[in-house]
């Protein structure tokens, strides 16, 4: 029963957890303006993986995709493949864990193979979770050393008389999502790793012995005894809560000239 | 047709307040809206803004202290507020709404405020 | 603040002739994340409110004739008209509308010579 619990809420978390990765991985808002003290700018851009944003006090808000592919920071690139290397391998994993769930009946497959899906399945969302998390940290860290490099140039003139305030860029809600995601898709991993000793067969170390009657041969062989947890669903009532943030941004539609959102 | 109808005329006494009034019509009130001064044969300057929206303003340093912006949405109308007057403040105040680049698409007729003792 | 520089202060241009004029701003006013100029021209005829004619540098609003245009990008900006006509004799506004405080410019008095 317990085995079943796990590795069902281990599916669950890790499902939410890949959830999570998918939309950090889409979300616009990787790396947005920095606006402690004041807005400076009467614009605020903000940024993700695939395009960049600006958002107007108009209301106005215009997208770009990143259109080019060798011009982009490798930094950005490595960030992009760790994360969709994270959602690649946790889609394998659920996809696995689907055929591995013990309450799941498929033909007649031996627990020992639930067992060793389960622990695949584990062993990927571990893996996915680490990427996700590697990703996003990757990205947060570049979004650090940018944030003091431009600090530290942000009053400097360019040598003449114009000035450039540079824009900072600060964590964006993907970073939080992200992080928060990887850690329940390596929690939900976990979870399946320890689910599959439980529903891995037990061993015995006990040898046949054979006992000779005179009459006739009868062989006795004292087997394991295995409990088996049965394949009804827990019905306690337990209520599996998302610990991820929930961002309402601003929906802005174009202003036109009679109805400036 | 979008409108930005202003308060009449104010004359007012050295040290005292003036709030002006900016009525919209014809669309719907939910971006900022600007204020604008314009002394006599002078340029324009920028007061503040506020948001129809969620009440939230930014001013100018330079008039901060002595200004108010306020809303009331039930009637789509702005006030702006201006206190301790002194005679520099005699002008005409525009109110505006706002457009793509953040430009001001729409004005209010413009209120003439004259600080006079 | 952003100091926004209006040249020259009045222009005087004969009707057809074509009339230019420039601002200047302390700081750039291009946003490299959509790279557009918040700059913008007003047309402000005595007694009357300021009238949008161009914004992001050079995007014309709606209703305004094809002779006004507007250029540059950065710090240096221009309005022109390519042919003046009589109806576009008026004072003229650029403002930053990229940093906070919003600025204007001096104002340039267009007149027929």
């Known amino acids: 029963m317990a085995v079943t619990a796990c590795q069902g809420l281990g599916f669950v978390v890790s499902l939410i957890g890949i959830a999570g990765i998918i939309a950090a991985t889409c979300m616009d808002q990787w790396s947005t303006q920095d606006l402690y003290n004041n807005p400076v700018t009467a614009v605020f851009n903000y940024q993700g993986l695939w395009r960049s944003c600006v958002r107007e006090s108009s209301g106005f808000t215009e997208c770009r995709g990143y259109f080019t592919l060798l011009g982009l920071p490798a930094m950005l690139q490595a960030v992009r493949a760790l994360m969709i290397v994270g959602i690649v391998l946790g889609a394998i994993g659920l996809l696995v864990s689907i055929f591995a769930l013990k309450c799941i009946r498929i033909g007649s497959m031996e627990d020992s193979a639930k067992a060793n899906m389960t622990l695949t399945s584990g062993i990927m969302f571990i893996v996915s979770g680490l990427c996700a998390i590697a990703g996003v940290s990757v990205f947060a860290n570049m979004l650090v050393t940018n944030f003091w490099m431009s600090t530290a140039n942000m009053y400097t003139g360019m040598g003449g008389m114009v000035q450039t305030v540079q824009t900072r860029y600060t964590f964006g809600a993907a970073l939080f999502v992200g992080w928060v995601a990887g850690g329940l898709t390596l929690i939900g991993g976990v979870m399946m790793c320890i689910a599959c000793r439980g529903l891995a067969p037990e061993e015995t170390n006990y040898k046949a012995v054979s006992y000779h009657a005179s009459g006739h041969s009868v062989a006795y062989k004292p087997g394991g005894f295995k409990a088996s947890t049965g394949f009804g669903s827990n019905t306690k009532n337990k209520k599996i809560y998302d610990g991820g943030a929930r961002t309402e941004d601003e929906v802005q539609s174009y202003p036109s000239k009679h109805d400036y959102v | 047709q979008v409108q930005l109808v202003q308060s009449g005329a104010e004359v007012v006494k050295p040290g005292a307040s003036v709030k002006l009034s900016c009525k919209a019509s014809?669309?719907?009130?939910?971006?900022?809206v600007h204020w604008v001064i314009q002394a006599p044969g002078q340029g324009l300057e920028w007061i503040g803004e506020i948001n129809p929206t969620n009440a939230r303003s930014n001013y100018n340093e330079k008039f901060k202290k002595r200004v108010t912006l306020t809303l009331d949405r039930s009637t789509s109308t702005v006030y702006m507020e201006l206190s301790s007057l002194r005679s520099e403040d005699t002008a005409v105040y525009f109110c505006?709404?706002?457009?793509?680049?953040?430009?001001?698409?729409?004005w209010g007729q413009g209120t003439l405020v004259t600080v006079s003792s | 603040d952003i100091v926004m520089t209006q040249s020259p202060d009045s222009l005087a241009v004969s009707l057809g002739e074509r009339a230019t004029i420039n601002c200047k701003s302390s700081?750039?006013?291009?946003?490299?994340?959509?790279?557009?100029?918040?700059l913008t021209w007003y047309q402000q005829k005595p007694g009357q409110p300021p009238k949008l004619l161009i914004y992001w540098s050079s995007t014309r609003e709606s209703g305004v004739p094809d002779r006004f245009s507007g250029s540059g990008s950065g710090t240096d900006f221009t309005l022109t008209i390519s042919s003046l006509q009589a109806e576009d004799v008026a004072v003229y506004h650029c403002?930053?509308?990229?940093?906070?405080?919003?600025?204007f410019g001096g104002g340039t008095k267009l007149e027929i010579k």
């Open positions: 505006a709404g706002i457009y793509y680049g953040n430009s001001f698409a729409h």
């Open positions: 403002q930053n509308n990229y940093y906070y405080p919003l600025t």
């Open positions: 700081q750039s006013l291009l946003n490299a994340g959509n790279q557009k100029n918040y």
């Open positions: 014809g669309y719907t009130f939910t971006n900022w």
